[in-house]
């Protein structure tokens, strides 16, 4: 059973996760960004369903396109260049998703915009930091 | 001094078109990005849409999009808001604002506004 | 789109007293350029929108040091430290993180 300490350092990493997300959608969607309508082409993969940390396998699977995207940016829109952002990312992903089980992502037929696809990882993070407050 | 002067606005059946126009002065109006916001009677304020200072980039809220269309020419420091089928709940004062984004500032400087009335 | 909720939505104050107004937003506000877009504005009965803060705190030209803003993340506020006549309006705060947005505004009078 989960302690309330582990329960703690899950809800602190989602809310980093969470953070990082949102930064990056503030980067992306935004009227001063040059590169927004050319971003809105990519095409990104959306899970089937995203109600548990496993599920997190879904989002890992498509960090190596959303660096790509975030490459787009010019430098002065990110503090942090995209692969650290990234690298960022994916350290608490795999943490949270933990690595000893291993699941295959289910991906929904239809694709996404990258402002679609990092709200629904946003509402993701939110749905399951609710449930641990 | 620094200014935005809208005009244009008046009383419109709906559906109608009605074009309204932001002159500016005392400022390099092509190095600024420009705003149209609305405010409805005795409601709060409402972005509507901005374009980039060389024109290159024009973004729309979603209840105007399909509809309104921004545009400027830098060579009369003049901004425009081309508004087509509009419907009542497009009344509203209309401000257009300033933006350098470079600066950090946001909208800092704001016209007087222009009243747009869409009625039968 | 991101949300703002000013409260409160109306504020009699005494003239010589402070006055402050929240502001939440549902979304961080932090830009990946580390900047956090979130700006004050009054608006003085019958007269367009005036700034007075950028970017959380940072007084625009010519705003008295009476004016005040602070926050951090999604919460954010815009204190008055002693009211005045002139101060009479609505206050507004605004983001320009993403595309923009306004809080629905909260009106400041004399008691």
């Known amino acids: 059973a989960p302690t309330s300490s582990s329960t703690k350092k899950t809800q602190l990493q989602l809310e980093h996760l969470l953070l990082d997300l949102q930064m990056i959608l503030n980067g992306i969607n935004n009227y001063k960004n040059p590169k927004l309508t050319r971003m809105l082409t990519f095409k990104f993969y959306m899970p089937k369903k995203a109600t548990e940390l496993k599920h997190l396998q879904c989002l890992e699977e498509e960090l190596k396109p959303l660096e790509e995207v975030l490459n787009l940016a010019q430098s002065k829109n990110f503090h942090l260049r995209p692969r650290d952002l990234i690298s960022n990312i994916n350290v608490i992903v795999l943490e949270l998703k933990g690595s000893e089980t291993t699941f295959m992502c289910e991906y929904a037929d239809e694709t996404a915009t990258i402002v679609e696809f990092l709200n629904r990882w946003i509402t993701f993070c939110q749905s399951i930091i609710s449930t641990l407050t | 001094q620094v200014q935005l002067v809208e005009s244009g606005g008046g009383v419109v059946q709906p559906g109608r078109s009605l074009r309204l126009s932001c002159a500016a002065s005392g400022f390099t109006f092509s190095i600024y990005g420009m705003h149209w916001v609305r405010q409805a009677p005795g409601k709060g304020l409402e972005w509507v849409t901005v374009i980039w200072y060389d024109g290159s980039n024009e973004y729309y809220a979603d209840s105007v999009k399909g509809r309104f269309t921004i545009s400027r020419d830098n060579s009369k420091n003049t901004l425009y808001l081309q508004m087509n089928s509009l419907r009542a709940e497009d009344t509203a004062v209309y401000y257009c604002?300033?933006?350098?984004?470079?600066?950090?500032?946001?909208?800092?400087?704001w016209g007087q506004g222009t009243t747009v009335t869409v009625s039968s | 789109d991101i949300v703002l909720t000013q409260t409160p939505l109306s504020s009699p104050v005494t003239l010589g007293q402070p006055a402050s107004i929240s502001c939440r937003s549902s979304?961080?506000?932090?830009?990946?350029?580390?900047?956090?877009?979130l700006s004050w504005l009054q608006q003085r009965p019958g007269q367009p929108p005036r700034l007075l803060i950028y970017k959380i705190s940072n007084r625009f030209s010519g705003v008295p040091d009476r004016f005040t803003g602070s926050g951090t993340g999604t919460d954010f506020t815009l204190k008055i430290s002693r009211v005045e006549a002139g101060d009479v309006g609505v206050y507004y705060c605004?983001?320009?993180?993403?595309?923009?947005?306004f809080g629905q505004g909260t009106k400041v009078e004399i008691k």
């Open positions: 604002a300033r933006e350098d984004f470079d600066s950090h500032y946001g909208m800092d400087v």
């Open positions: 979304h961080h506000l932090i830009h990946s350029d580390g900047n956090t877009y």
């Open positions: 605004m983001q320009t993180t993403q595309f923009p947005t």
